[in-house]
């Protein structure tokens, strides 16, 4: 796993070496992943004109990317710590297949894509330690993920560029909402 800036390598490599409920470690971890996403978005935007595409045009896709909704209890109005934490973990687990898809989509930022993927896995571990209502967390079926990955990789170049852009944008928005919510936990 990549070492986060300002963290000891043992903190990340051996996640049980310190209490995992530390808000600060989760906060720093998410911000590290967001920095990685920014770098990946930069390469994507330099490579294609997807970043100029209107939100409306991009919305017309059949990707089922995780998104925060009012019912998830992660927004300031109607905030619910338990419900929100479950949503964040479930959402991150759902994003994993999309992060796997990103692995072969970058040239100069190949290591950055790997770091985002591995850091997300560590973040999920942190959050699962924090959650008491683990029964409510649904893990995506491996077979479903495998067929989705195959389908995404079979798209033409233009669709692959659009998919990459949408994943990064959605993951960024999901993490930003998560970050704000986790700061009240």
């Amino acid at each position: 796993a990549p070492v986060l800036p300002g963290e000891d390598s043992k903190d990340v490599a051996a996640p049980h070496s310190q209490p995992l409920t530390s808000s600060e470690r989760i906060d720093k971890h998410i911000r590290y992943i967001l920095d990685g996403i920014s770098a990946l978005r930069k390469e994507t935007c330099n490579r294609s004109n997807m970043c100029e595409s209107s939100k409306e045009a991009l919305a017309e896709n059949n990707l089922n990317l995780p998104k925060m909704a009012e019912k998830d209890g992660c927004f300031q109005s109607g905030f619910n710590e338990d419900t929100c934490l479950v949503k964040i973990i479930t959402g991150l687990l759902e994003f994993e297949v999309y992060l796997e898809y990103l692995q072969n989509r970058f040239e100069s930022s190949e290591e950055q894509a790997r770091a985002v993927q591995m850091s997300t896995k560590v973040l999920i571990q942190f959050l699962q330690k924090k959650a008491k209502n683990l029964d409510a967390i649904t893990t995506p079926e491996p077979t479903t993920n495998a067929s989705l990955l195959t389908k995404l990789q079979a798209q033409n170049q233009w669709l692959q560029d659009m998919t990459t852009h949408l994943i990064l944008r959605s993951f960024k928005e999901f993490l930003q909402s998560s970050l704000r919510a986790l700061r009240q936990m």
């Epitope: 600060e24 906060d27 109005s77 710590e81 338990d82 700061r183 009240q184 936990m185």
Partner: antibody
Framework: EVQLVESGGGLVQPGGSLRLSCAAS????????MSWVRQAPGKGLEWVSR????????YYADSVKGRFTISRDNAKNTLYLQMNSLKPEDTAVYYC?????????????WGQGTQVTVSS | QSVLTQPPSVSGSPGQTVTISCAGT?????????VSWYQQLPGMAPKLLIY???KRASGIADRFSGSKSGNTASLTISGLQSEDEADYYC??????????FGGGTHLTVLG
Amino acid sequence: EVQLVESGGGLVQPGGSLRLSCAASGFTFSSYAMSWVRQAPGKGLEWVSRISSGGISTYYADSVKGRFTISRDNAKNTLYLQMNSLKPEDTAVYYCVRYAWGVQWAFDFWGQGTQVTVSS
Amino acid sequence: QSVLTQPPSVSGSPGQTVTISCAGTSEDVGYGNYVSWYQQLPGMAPKLLIYDVNKRASGIADRFSGSKSGNTASLTISGLQSEDEADYYCASYRRTIDNIFGGGTHLTVLG
């Protein structure tokens, strides 16, 4: 208008107990993490304890760990601090404080405080 | 309790600029953008001025600004006014402690 009103302070002997309460109004209490911060006479501020918005996670300063318990009742919009085995060095004004939404470790609203005096 | 180091007092005349420093370590002030500043007027509860090192809290005049260099944070008050006379506290996250405050600085606005 956000209001935090502390109560329950008073004079107590060393080894005694007190329970502080903080009645919150003017905001959605259940959406915010809360803390207690204290200030000894003529001294600076000291963070005492924090509780997450839903009451799932609690955190304590080493100086009070094992003696103080923070809790909350979101249905009553009230924050509590149960203080046991009190020591003279716990004498202070205790403030109930709210964490700013989406901001790490910054208190955007403070109550007026309640005085706790531990003396024989 | 261990605290961040602030000068006990600073002073300035109306209209002047004063800076209050807050020295910590790589474990607190230097660790992230987690520094905040509070103003405590005599007999009152503290009030948030600055959070995340340099962001002004709602309703705070732009005369108040925050910055950080290494393990030291600073609060700068420009165009000093008589009502700025108060105690000022810095605060930061410190690993395992959650929040650590400075010892406080009393600002005197001269005659």
